[in-house]
């Protein structure tokens, strides 16, 4: 995915990433020899970011906008090395990886958490959902596990049928080579689909309206 290509444009940075970078620089100036406890530093940054006004955040948002423009500009002229696409091709017709029991639970309870805690960040909502799942009795997890198992079964049938159809250019390659790479390909797909699941969850979090609880 272009990790080794030095010509590949540097990824775009979010306003929060710029803020963290600034925090890091400030910290280095104040304590040049001190080693940084990463989790503690992250926590402090996060707390500071939460208390910052929109005006204060504006500076970093402008930096992020400028960086996004730079990235888009550079990507237009960037040619990936031979044999590599900008992003691994994903067939939109390929069956979607099924959600886990926990993912189904999250879909069910995310609005509740956001309703009860309107100011919560995506990460904190996820943390609360994890805590809630851990506080749920095994019997009560069963319907989610059953549904997830059903969806997994369906996915396995669908993916088998999808693979049986095969990709046109795959037939040209040797059968032995194809068999060898099959396991690796499945692992990659699983990893990729897990990323998708996380991305979707983040998107859902960003899209959902936050409603107050008791009126």
């Amino acid at each position: 995915m272009g990790k080794g290509d030095p010509k590949k444009p540097r990824g775009k940075m979010s306003s929060y990433a710029f803020f963290v970078q600034t925090c890091r620089e400030e910290h280095k100036k104040k304590h040049p020899d001190a080693s940084v406890n990463f989790s503690e530093f992250s926590k402090k940054c996060s707390e500071r970011w939460k208390t910052m006004s929109a005006k204060e955040k504006g500076k970093f948002e402008d930096m992020a906008k400028a960086d996004k423009a730079r990235y888009e500009r550079e990507m237009k002229t960037y040619i990936p090395p031979k044999g590599e696409t900008k992003k691994k091709f994903k067939d939109p017709n390929a069956p979607k990886r099924p959600p886990s029991a926990f993912f189904l639970f999250c879909s069910e309870y995310r609005p509740k958490i956001k309703g009860e805690h309107p100011g919560l960040s995506i990460g904190d909502v996820a943390k609360k959902l994890g805590e809630m799942w851990n506080n749920t009795a095994a019997d009560d997890k069963q319907p989610y596990e059953k549904k997830a198992a059903k969806l997994k079964e369906k996915y396995e049938k669908d993916i088998a049928a999808y693979r049986a159809k095969g990709k046109p250019d795959a037939a040209k390659k040797g059968v032995v080579k194809a068999e060898k790479s099959k396991k690796k390909k499945e692992e990659e797909e699983d990893e990729e689909d897990e990323e998708d699941e996380e991305e979707e969850e983040d998107e859902e979090d960003e899209d959902e309206e936050e409603d107050d609880d008791d009126e």
Epitope: E108, Y109, P111, E131, D139, D211, D213, E215
Partner: antibody, heavy 122, light 108 residues
């Protein structure tokens, strides 16, 4: 004001059916698990059924499984209990209750309706 | 299923006295899964304590909960006239939400 108001109770013959309703107000109904809990005359409390916020997941006590169906209409802020094949032992006051999750301190029924009486008798 | 046994069945006390209500589970219950409710005649139950020891909103501090594992206690430090009622403990350990049979606190 946060409120739950049950209706639909009454006298029914054994083997008959009844549909209870619970109207919710003052809170975001679609964010909560809802329960039906019953209390036979002079007896203790017994949970009957539970439904998840979207209505996609339901749970029943063994004593009512296969006879009762819990459902909800989030657009109407209403919870339902369809009771079929009623028996004399189903005679009770039926309460709807909201399940509240108190972070790591667990779960409890924090809001209850006033109850509706169901009498199964010939 | 986890059975909840409350004792005593009835507690006869005078206003101003201390009430100690016991609730025993047939097997260990997580503290976060134990709650106490108060019910007066003709009324719906009211949540008093959740997570074994946390008072619900609006509950006076004369009510306190304690305990862990299989033994839990509800204490009313000084009984007020409005405290005479039936008290139920309730656990959530499986999808069975079981209640104790109740303890009636009556005026002596």
């Amino acid at each position: 004001e946060v409120q739950l108001l049950e209706s639909g109770g009454g006298l029914v013959q054994p083997g008959g059916s009844l549909r209870l309703s619970c109207a919710a107000s003052g809170f975001t109904f679609s964010s909560y698990d809802m329960f039906w809990v019953r209390q036979a005359p002079g007896k203790g409390l017994e949970w009957v059924s539970r439904i998840s916020p979207s209505g996609g997941y339901t749970y029943y006590a063994d004593s009512v499984k296969g006879r009762f169906t819990i459902s909800r209409d989030n657009s109407k802020n209403t919870l339902y209990l369809q009771m079929n094949s009623l028996r004399a032992e189903d005679t009770a006051v039926y309460y709807c209750a909201r399940l509240r999750y108190f972070d790591s301190r667990g779960y409890a029924f924090d809001i209850w309706g006033q109850g509706t009486m169901v009498t199964v008798s010939s | 299923d986890i059975q909840m046994t409350q004792s005593p069945g009835t507690l006869s006390l005078s206003p101003g006295e201390r009430a100690t209500l016991s609730c025993r589970a047939s097997q260990s219950v997580r503290s976060s899964y134990l709650a106490w409710y108060q019910q007066k005649p003709g009324q719906a139950p009211r949540l008093l304590i959740y997570g074994a020891s946390t008072r619900a909103t609006g509950i006076p501090d004369r009510f306190s909960g304690s305990g862990s594992g299989t033994d839990f206690t509800l204490t009313i430090s000084r009984l007020e006239p409005e405290d005479f009622a039936v008290y139920y403990c309730q656990q959530y350990g499986t999808s069975r939400w079981t209640f104790g049979q109740g303890t009636k606190v009556e005026i002596k």
